[in-house]
């Protein structure tokens, strides 16, 4: 509808324009994870703050039970950062004995669940070997990309080791999505 | 306004649609930081190139004195990458003596300043321990997320050690924001 | 056009509004790289999956011969993640002999090619020294930012060492762009 002129019409059909301000959007922030039952053979899912501090959901984008619910079909930009922290990894301890070894690792996965589809879909994965040598280590993994989602899809963030997630500050570990 | 038909009306009210091309946007790129005075008890803020090369500000998004000024309220996607570089960290030097130690670290914070609010708000933080062992090390920290900002808010990027920022190339260290 | 009222007019001029759903967008995912001839003095470019699995191109954004073709001028958000994996780097082997050394490194560059301009433009670079000490290492580099592009511009992703790219999963290594 670029700069066109229109004569008034009783049957004027408009393209599917919409106000940007009413698009589904969410930014969720870290909370301390309480021990829960996780699905077998699947990394545990994080749960999130959705209304306090920097966190919000709006325009029918709802958060429930570790999932962001997609209220309408379209292309979404989805992002997450998880900050991990830990002590010296076994990897470096084994290394000191001079043997090659499988490294420790940290992994973040943003997963899509579609009720009509039996298996979750991994949308994004960030995975990193950790062979740190200082007594404490900490580092973030950031992910973000665009995906075509359907109304009713659910998004979650899974991590390889929930006990290594830094839950201390809302700016260190977060998860968000917005309709483009 | 999805595919609806409208009869002309003397009082037709339109939703707050707007051309995407007139939304506030900025992409700032690194410049060399010269020694300056910084606020006490706060990581130093970077200053930026805002008009040469890949850098730009548009549609009333202005850059002044290390700050991006938010010209209208709304949801913004904000991002930054800072590439750090340094020599072997003290951490690894101490480590060679066989003692556990507090690691060196590098940190990036995207901060919001609201004049009516006494304390800056940390929107995003990327922090990483550095226990490198080669003679030179370098690595980026990337951040990006969506936030609800108010007209008049100011954004800046703070770093833990300003003298370790790689200022050599505009594609290595940058800062941007755009209204969704 | 915020909440204004309009009397019908035979000459009503509209701002350049457009449906979000018809904007050029692409998300490309990793495929196994086959050995090809690379340009001298330039990091090799990755080629991508553009229609299977999570990958798509839409609204005249086309993928051809390692390039994303920009179909219309405007501000685009461009992103990529490349996951690298390798064996213990020479850096750490040399280090064990007690000599200082130049670190190995991994680098990702998102490059713009404009036919009318002789030299490619590096838009984004993520570069990281790799002095890992475990026998296997792996890690992602993520990049994303907004750029003003012109119709006909071409985008590609270059990497320092194509043989270290993890091509095993579409969620680990990807490349995308969308018109804002």
């Amino acid at each position: 509808l670029k700069g066109q002129e229109f004569a008034p019409s009783h049957q004027q059909v408009y393209a599917p324009l919409r106000a940007d301000g009413d698009k589904p959007r969410a930014h969720l922030t870290v909370v301390r994870q309480t021990p829960t039952q996780h699905f077998k053979n699947q990394f545990p899912a994080l749960h999130w703050e959705h209304e306090l501090g920097l966190a919000f959901t709006k325009n029918r984008m709802n958060y429930t039970n570790k999932f962001l619910l997609i209220p309408e079909s379209g292309d979404y930009f989805i992002y997450s950062q998880v900050t991990f922290r830990g002590m010296t990894s076994e990897c470096s301890e084994i290394r000191q004995a001079g043997r090659p070894n499988k490294p420790d690792s940290i992994t973040v996965v943003i997963t899509k669940v579609t009720d009509s589809y039996p298996e979750p879909t991994q949308l994004l994965m960030g995975t990193k070997s950790v062979c740190e040598v200082g007594s404490n280590w900490f580092q973030p993994i950031y992910l973000g990309a665009m995906f075509s989602l359907q109304e009713g899809d659910k998004l979650m963030v899974n991590v390889s080791d929930i006990s290594l997630v830094d839950y201390t500050k809302e700016d260190k570990t977060f998860f968000g999505a917005f309709l483009l | 306004l999805k595919g609806q038909e409208f009869a002309p009306s003397h009082q037709q009210v339109y939703a707050p649609l707007r051309a995407d091309g007139d939304k506030p946007r900025a992409h700032l790129t690194v410049v060399r930081q010269t020694p300056t005075q910084h606020f006490k008890n706060q990581f130093p803020a970077l200053h930026w190139e805002h008009e040469l090369g890949l850098a730009f500000t548009k549609n009333r998004m202005n850059y002044t004195n290390k700050f991006l000024l938010i010209p209208e309220s709304g949801d913004y996607f904000i991002y930054s990458q800072v590439t750090f570089r340094g020599m072997t960290s003290e951490c690894s030097e101490i480590r060679q003596a066989g003692r556990p130690n507090k690691p060196d670290s590098i940190t990036v914070v995207i901060t919001k300043v609201t004049d009516s609010y006494p304390e800056p708000t940390q929107l995003l933080m990327g922090t990483k321990s550095v226990c490198e062992v080669g003679s030179n090390w370098f690595q980026p920290i990337y951040l990006g997320a969506m936030f609800s900002l108010q007209e008049g808010d100011k954004l800046m990027v703070n770093v833990s050690d300003i003298s370790l920022v790689d200022y050599t190339k505009e594609d290595k260290t940058f800062f941007g924001a755009f209204l969704l | 056009l915020k909440g204004q009222e309009f009397a019908p007019s035979h000459q009503q001029v509209y701002a350049p509004l457009r449906a979000d759903g018809d904007k050029p967008r692409a998300h490309l995912t990793v495929v196994r790289q086959t050995p090809t001839q690379h340009f001298k003095n330039q990091f090799p470019a990755l080629h991508w999956e553009h229609e299977l699995g999570l990958a798509f191109t839409k609204n005249r954004m086309n993928y051809t011969n390692k390039f994303l073709l920009i179909p219309e001028s405007g501000d685009y958000f461009i992103y990529s993640q490349v996951t690298f994996r390798g064996m213990t780097s020479e850096c750490s082997e040399i280090r064990q002999a007690g000599r200082p050394n130049k670190p190995d490194s991994i680098t990702v560059v998102i490059t713009k090619v404009t036919d009318s301009y002789p030299e490619p433009t590096q838009l984004l670079m993520g570069t990281k020294s790799v002095c890992e000490v475990g026998s296997n290492w792996f890690q992602p580099i993520y990049l994303g930012a907004m750029f003003s592009l012109q119709e006909g511009d071409k985008l590609m992703v270059n990497v320092s060492d194509i043989s270290l790219v993890d091509y095993t999963k579409e969620d680990k290594t990807f490349f995308g762009a969308f018109l804002l």
């Epitope: - | 930081q33 020694p35 020599m87 003290e90 003298s163 050599t168 | -």
Partner: antibody, heavy 118, light 107 residues
Framework: EVQLVQSGAEVKSPGASVKVSCKAS????????MHWVRQAPGQGLEWMGW????????KYAQKFQGRVTVTRDTSISTAYMELNRLTSDDTAVYYC???????????WGQGTMVTVSS | DIVMTQSPSSLSASVGDRVTITCRAS??????LNWYQQKPGKAPNFLIY???RLQSGVPSRFSGSGSGTDFTLTISSLQPEDFATYYC?????????FGPGTKVDIK
């Protein structure tokens, strides 16, 4: 205005030590690395080492290792360079310099002439 | 240590001349190359960083180029105040090393 003011000229005997001071003003002293560079008469520039005033961490050129010590006093925004076991080859102008990044030298002190003579 | 060499070691030029000084590193230093100007009896003055980026306040007649091992400093139109000695310096790895200098004097 960023300024580095160095102590005055020194005359030393071979085998002695010299300690040169460098007082910084106009910027946050702890945020930027302080370097020491020397220049023998009619010769080029030679980097000696740095201090990170925040952590106190130092790095020295191998040539000076074991003979040079760089320290700082953050309470008075001052860095010091001490060079031991002086010989006539150490006769030079010694500069402190601060960089906006650790690998370059934006602002220089006025220099301190150290003469080693028997 | 990375060895920096400069050429020529000295040159004579007139006001208005275009002057080019080259600097070579013994190994790749990426873009971590800085240029300084020094006048007799004075401390050096920082001109160019990152091989090609002009330090704030430095006249635009100065420019730098190169990456890897070969670098150039160019003065497009020599001014009376530009007669001095010019040093390149690598900031890639410790110890930081300088070139031997190029003296630019009046023809």
């Amino acid at each position: 205005e960023v300024q580095l003011v160095q102590s005055g000229a020194e005359v030393k005997s071979p085998g002695a030590s010299v300690k040169v001071s460098c007082k910084a003003s106009g910027y946050t002293f702890t945020a930027y690395y302080m370097h020491w560079v020397r220049q023998a008469p009619g010769q080029g520039l030679e980097w000696m080492g740095w201090i990170n005033p925040n952590s106190g961490g130092t790095k020295y050129a191998q040539k000076f290792q074991g003979r040079v010590t760089v320290t700082r006093d953050t309470s008075i925004s001052t860095a010091y360079m001490e060079l031991n076991r002086l010989t006539s080859d150490d006769t030079a102008v010694y500069y402190c310099a601060v960089g906006g990044s650790y690998d370059a030298f934006d602002i220089w002190g006025q220099g301190t002439m150290v003469t080693v003579s028997s | 240590d990375i060895v920096m060499t400069q050429s020529p070691s000295s040159l004579s030029a007139s006001v208005g001349d275009r002057v080019t000084i080259t600097c070579r590193a013994s190994q790749s230093i990426s873009s971590y190359l800085n240029w300084y100007q020094q006048k007799p009896g004075k401390a050096p003055n920082f001109l160019i960083y990152g091989a090609s980026r002009l330090q704030s306040g430095v006249p635009s007649r100065f420019s730098g180029s190169g990456s890897g091992t070969d670098f150039t400093l160019t003065i497009s139109s020599l001014q009376p105040e530009d007669f001095a000695t010019y040093y390149c310096q690598q900031g890639y790895s410790s110890p930081f090393t300088f070139g031997p200098g190029t003296k630019v004097d009046i023809k």
